[in-house]
């Protein structure tokens, strides 16, 4: 079991426990910040990020941000706390095991973002509509 003196330590956000007092392990995420990408017009892409990091805080999840403008395409991979907005957007899908890209409105560019909570889940980013929970048929399956 967890040593009692660990549980009684300073109350800060590096220690996250469940209802039973068990300490939550941090997520393992791809973390290359912003890199140029060749991912375009594909159902899914690999991040091509060779760095897997231990997220600093156990509540953080994996995030990927795909952006396209007149000049280039970039893919950003990071850890982020879903309680906080990222690029001014809430991470709605933080509990998902897969990184399903959702388009967000940003002037002057095409902007997609996804978040997820399984090991290195932001390594495989999915654009395909068949995974998108805005699809009513899929929602029907989920809630049955």
């Amino acid at each position: 079991t967890i040593p009692p003196h660990v549980q009684k330590s300073v109350n800060n956000d590096m220690i996250v426990t469940d209802n039973n007092g068990a300490v939550k392990f941090p997520q393992l995420c791809k973390f290359c910040d912003v890199r140029f990408s060749t991912c375009d017009n594909q159902k899914s892409c690999m991040s091509n990020c060779s760095i897997t990091s231990i997220c600093e805080k156990p509540q953080e999840v994996c995030v990927a941000v795909w952006r396209k403008n007149d000049e280039n395409i970039t893919l950003e991979t990071v850890c982020h706390d879903p309680k906080l907005p990222y690029h001014d957007f809430i991470l709605e899908d933080a509990a998902s095991p897969k990184c399903i890209m959702k388009e967000k409105k940003k002037p002057g560019e095409t902007f997609f973002m996804c978040s997820c909570s399984s090991d290195e889940c932001n390594d495989n980013i999915i654009f395909s509509e068949e995974y998108n929970t805005s699809n009513p048929d899929l929602l029907l399956v989920i809630f049955q």
Partner: nanobody, 119 residues
Framework: EVQLLESGGGLVQPGGSLRLSCAAS???????RMWWVRQAPGKGLEWVS?????????YYADSVKGRFTISRDNSKNTLYLQMNSLRAEDTAVYYC????????????WGQGTLVTVSS
Amino acid sequence: EVQLLESGGGLVQPGGSLRLSCAASGFTFAEDRMWWVRQAPGKGLEWVSAIDPQGQHTYYADSVKGRFTISRDNSKNTLYLQMNSLRAEDTAVYYCAKQSTGSATSDYWGQGTLVTVSS
């Protein structure tokens, strides 16, 4: 009964090295991801390093990348942490913890070994 017993801590000068060990028993060691976690005096936990069950994948916190190396010997049920180029800020109690496959929370920890980096 699951047991994790850390050893190898001690006093070391800045720039020095130490090798921590964690002897495991009471479970199938080769099936679990293992972690090294540390707690500096008066601070929260810092997740230092992790290693997958067969040792093929290793993970490090940014603060120790390039200085620490995690490894395991499944035939000896032992986890290791080789710590080089030690700094004062590495001073902490170091714990090993097991993460069962599919589990997001820790189920067992060792009692810890104290590492003090000071001149």
